[in-house]
């Protein structure tokens, strides 16, 4: 290891995983347990992130890099670097202040996280509903009614009594 790279600042020679120890003539001391430095020339080491409680360790802290956390089963990460864990809900639900609630009629959520979103309005694109929406699934839009003239397609149009997007609850 080259210790003479910088005559001006001996600390610039200290690599990641060390800190420049002023108490010991600016030698490159190891980052002590549960701390790290990810860049060279550091005068202190950073304390490792603790993945506790609802967080679990995805990657342990090393001398040169911080720990990385994810969430325990039943929770998912939010924020940069998984700074928060949010409770999972079932598909067809969204998380509210009062806990997991079913999606309102006309909305769906096909994931365990996030909010319920409105079903696609097929008619805006001049299409018809091929498969009805549910709490867990969006509607499937099919060809426009005009494309469904007799003999033009083998697709059976939806029952006329149903409104677009309706789903039996």
């Amino acid at each position: 290891f080259e210790r003479t790279r910088s005559l001006q600042d001996p600390c610039s020679n200290c690599p990641a995983g060390t800190f420049c120890d002023n108490n010991r003539n600016q030698i490159c001391s190891p980052c002590p347990p549960n701390s790290f430095s990810s860049a060279g020339g550091q005068r202190t080491c950073d304390i490792c992130r603790q993945c506790k409680g609802v967080f679990r360790t995805r990657k342990e802290c090393s001398s040169t890099s911080n720990a990385e956390c994810d969430c325990t089963p039943g929770f998912h990460c939010l924020g940069a670097g998984c700074s928060m864990c949010e409770q999972d809900c079932k598909q067809g639900q969204e998380l509210t202040k009062k806990g997991c609630k079913d999606c309102c009629f006309g909305t769906f959520n096909d994931q365990k996280r996030g909010i319920c979103r409105p079903w696609t309005n097929c008619s805006l694109d001049g299409k018809s509903v091929l498969v009805n929406g549910t709490k867990e699934r969006d509607v499937v839009c099919g060809p426009s009614p005009a494309d469904l003239s007799p003999g033009a397609s083998s697709v059976t149009p939806p029952a006329p009594a149903r409104e677009p997007g309706h789903s039996p609850q």
């Epitope: 290891f1 690599p15 060390t18 010991r24 002590p32 347990p33 549960n34 342990e60 001398s63």
Partner: antibody, heavy 117, light 112 residues
């Protein structure tokens, strides 16, 4: 899981040198300090020094400067400690250990070095 | 160098008893970063030492909760609430706050 596998026992003549190896598996070898410890019956445990394999930077207990030299090969995930100018005082079990939540979170099984004419 | 003095040298106990080992450092062992790197290790016959306690009072993973560490400054204690046969061996305290890092002389826990 973290494992440190050390080389086998050595019987050496006074004045000779010996090189002990410590092969690491189960973690990113280059990113953790490796420590070396000496144990002699009746003398307890002594810290020799340490090496950070990724950069090759090392620190030594003043008592072992000139006696021990640390190297590491990151392609084989193996650290080495060479002991020079052996005397009977160097007869001991030598351990490598990896830093973690503590200075010696994980230990090798030890290498017995015997110096005898 | 920081001298680590362990007492007693030998500790005869009956299984199920509480055991207490003292470790005193010749100077304060707070690191420059504010942490106290006082650790306890157990070495069973024919084995490598194993980490029990780190930073004075934290149990390492897999260490039974009958082991506890306490202390500050220069006085530290390891307690075993109910000694079991597998706890027998030599216990070492260690300070990693100052260079050179140093071990205590060891305390042998044995059956009375």
């Amino acid at each position: 899981q973290v494992q440190l596998q050390q080389s086998g026992a050595e019987l050496m003549k006074p004045g000779a040198s010996v090189k002990i190896s410590c092969k690491a598996t189960g973690y990113t070898f280059s990113s953790y300090w490796l420590e070396w410890i000496k144990q002699r019956p009746g003398h307890g445990l002594e810290w020799i020094g340490e090496i950070l394999p990724g950069s090759g930077v090392s620190n030594y207990n003043e008592k072992f400067k000139g006696k021990a030299t640390f190297t590491a090969n990151t392609s084989s995930n193996t650290a080495y400690m060479q002991l020079s100018s052996l005397t009977s005082e160097d007869s001991a079990v030598y351990y490598c250990a990896r830093l973690g939540l503590a200075w010696f979170a994980y230990w090798g099984q030890g290498t017995l070095v015997t110096v005898s004419a | 160098d920081v001298l680590m003095t362990q007492t007693p040298l030998s500790l005869p106990v009956s299984l199920g008893d509480q055991a207490s080992i003292s470790c005193r450092s010749s100077q304060n062992i707070v690191h420059g970063n504010g942490n106290t790197y006082l650790e306890w290790y157990l070495q069973k016959p024919g084995q490598s030492p194993k980490l029990l306690i780190y930073q004075v009072s934290n149990r390492f993973s897999g260490v039974p909760d009958r082991f506890s560490g306490s202390g500050s400054g220069t006085d530290f204690t390891l307690k075993i609430s109910r000694v079991e046969a597998e706890d027998l061996g030599v216990y070492y305290c260690f300070q990693g706050s100052h260079v050179p890092r140093t071990f205590g002389g060891g305390t042998k826990l044995e059956i009375k």
